[in-house]
Structures are given as C-alpha cells and as structure tokens.
C-alpha cells in the first residue's frame, strides 16, 4: 500500500465564489474515497466534480475532486480522504 499525497488548492471562480480542488496523487491500490465536507458533513455528488482515477506512470494513481464555495466560508470546508483503511482531513488554504 502506498498512501496518497493530498494537496488542496483554490482558484477564483465567479464573483464572490472560489473553486477549491483537492488532489490525491501517488497512491496504490487504486480504490480511494475523496469528497468535500461542509461543517463535517459530506456534500452531495451533484455539487462536486470528480476527476477519473488515472495511472500517473509510476505504478501509482492520481485523482481529484472540486467544488465551488462562497469566499469567506473557506474554514467550513474540508477535503476528506479515505484509502486502504486510513483517512485524513485537509483544510482549504487561506
């Protein structure tokens, strides 16, 4: 088992909103759960966009999940990752 490296980034979206993206990379095996949470509760599927789980060329995999949130509410959102029985939570950078 190779645990993922998780990185959260933010980018400007429409006025008053930002897009936050959570990337998991260099993990094996392929199965992973990656989702955005608000106040600890998972967002619905239709408010998130997922990338495919793709090989990254080193025998490991990468994927991402993104969602759009209101600027100023970043602290309410975290990216939750679960892989091979381990989990971690990652905040939006300020």
């Amino acid at each position: 088992t190779v645990p993922p490296m998780v990185n959260v980034t933010r980018s400007e979206a429409s006025e008053g909103n930002i897009t936050v993206t959570c990337r998991a990379s260099s993990f094996y095996p392929r199965n992973i759960a990656l989702t955005w949470r608000q106040d600890g509760v998972s967002l619905s599927h239709d408010t998130q966009q997922w990338g495919d789980v793709l090989p990254d060329g080193n025998g490991t995999y990468q994927t991402w999940v993104a969602t759009r949130i209101c600027r100023g509410e970043e602290q309410r959102f975290t990216c939750y990752m679960e892989h091979s029985g381990n989990h971690s939570t990652h905040p939006v950078p300020s």
Partner: antibody, heavy 122, light 112 residues
Framework: QGQMQQSGAELVKPGASVKLSCKTS????????ISWLKQKPGQSLEWIAW????????SYNQKFTAKAQLTVDTSSSTAYMQFSSLTTEDSAIYYC???????????????WGQGTLVTVSA | DVLMTQTPLSLPVSLGDQASLSCRSS???????????LEWYLQKPGQSPKLLIY???NRFSGVPDRFSGSGSGTDFTLKISRVEAEDLGVYYC?????????FGGGTKVEIK
C-alpha cells in the same frame, strides 16, 4: 461513545475573560468536531461555534465571533473556549458537545459534557 | 437566521398517553446536500440535553422505539407513543442545515 469532562463553575467580574475546558477520552480526538453551546437559566440553547480537532479549523455563529475563541490541545485531547469582555448577559451554562458524522448522515450534538456554570457579577 | 418555533410551550400528559410535539422552521431546512438535518433533544432538570432523533426520523442509539420523528420542509413532529416517567422534561428541536444552527424554544412535557 467516550466521555467529555468540563471544568468547574466560574464566578467572574464584568469585563474579565474566562477559559473553559472540555477534556475528552474514549475516542479519537483528532477525528472529531466539537461544538460549544450556551444556555441561560430557564431558556433554550444557542450554538456558539465548532472546532475540528484534526486541523483546528473553526466556524462561529456570527453573534459570538467577537466574544468566543475556540482552541484545542491534541496532546491532552482537550477543547477550550475563551470567552472575553464578559457581561451579565454571558451568565449561563456552557456545554461542549461532540458531533457524530457518517458522511451525509450522523448527528450534530451526539455526546455532551456536563456543562460549566459561568456567573458574571460585580 | 432560521427561527424554530415549538408548540405547545407546555404539554401536560398522563403516563401511558401519546404525546405529540410540533416544530416549525421559518424556512425550508434542506441542506445543500439534500438532507434535512432536523434533530430532537430531551433535557431533564439539572442534566445536559440528550439526542433522541437525528435527520428527522432516525432514532439515536439507545433511544426507545416509543419515540418517532416525522415531517419535511418546514413542519416537523415528535411523537411519544406511551409516555413514561423518564420522558418528562423539556424537548428541543434543532436545525443543522443552515448556519447559524438554531434551536426551538422548547416544549415542557409534564404530568397532568
């Protein structure tokens, strides 16, 4: 389920600050969201704020943003709330409570501390 | 803020009776993830509140099946099918769908 043990009653003067503690045991502290709530005698409850022990991230009820500051000490599995510039309106019982989430399910205040009575009086 | 209004303020009951408590929110309390985070708590004198029902109708662990929750949108109900002495106290509804999270004013269930 675990336990949440809150610090003892406080008698403080107007204008002062008080720091309440909520020591937890029996569960993985860093995986949990912990909220603080206020209840004045004979009244309903108000949610003050939550803190996520894993990152120290917080979200406040705007009514309390200038009044409350939440912190955690993961080494002792303890959550703290500092309440500042106290007035008689802040006299109340303050509770800590642990959220119990499972993805989109779960409960907000599943497990509670016993409460800390804060009395503000000259 | 979402205002949660509970009725009645006081509910006198006889042991063994059915009790029905009402909670109305000032706006729809469906979370952006599609769930309705409406909960019910019971607080007995001198004690911390205890969770009874979460997500409108789900009993929390250890809660007897005489407690049931229902409702949607803005109208919610807690029913106690046969009131026992240990059920007496103040019942609060709570919404966790919109920040700031808010409680109702409470319904006191007492002996008639």
């Amino acid at each position: 389920q675990g336990q949440m043990q809150q610090s003892g009653a406080e008698l403080v003067k107007p204008g002062a600050s008080v720091k309440l503690s909520c020591k937890t045991s029996g569960f993985t502290f860093s995986d949990n969201y912990i909220s603080w709530l206020k209840q004045k005698p004979g009244q309903s409850l108000e949610w003050i704020a939550w803190i996520y022990a894993g990152t120290g991230g917080t979200s406040y009820n705007q009514k309390f943003t200038a009044k409350a500051q939440l912190t955690v000490d993961t080494s002792s599995s303890t959550a703290y709330m500092q309440f500042s510039s106290l007035t008689t309106e802040d006299s109340a019982i303050y509770y800590c409570a642990r959220h119990d989430y499972y993805g989109t399910s779960g409960a907000w205040f599943a497990y509670w501390g016993q409460g800390t009575l804060v009395t503000v009086s000259a | 803020d979402v205002l949660m209004t509970q009725t009645p303020l006081s509910l006198p009951v006889s042991l063994g009776d059915q009790a029905s408590l009402s909670c109305r929110s000032s706006q729809n309390i469906v979370h952006i993830n599609g769930n309705t985070y409406l909960e019910w708590y019971l607080q007995k004198p001198g004690q911390s509140p205890k969770l009874l029902i979460y997500k409108v109708s789900n009993r929390f662990s250890g809660v007897p099946d005489r407690f049931s929750g229902s409702g949607s949108g803005t109208d919610f109900t807690l029913k106690i099918s046969r009131v026992e002495a240990e059920d007496l106290g103040v019942y609060y509804c709570f919404q966790g769908s919109h920040v700031p999270w808010t409680f109702g004013g409470g319904t006191k269930v007492e002996i008639k």
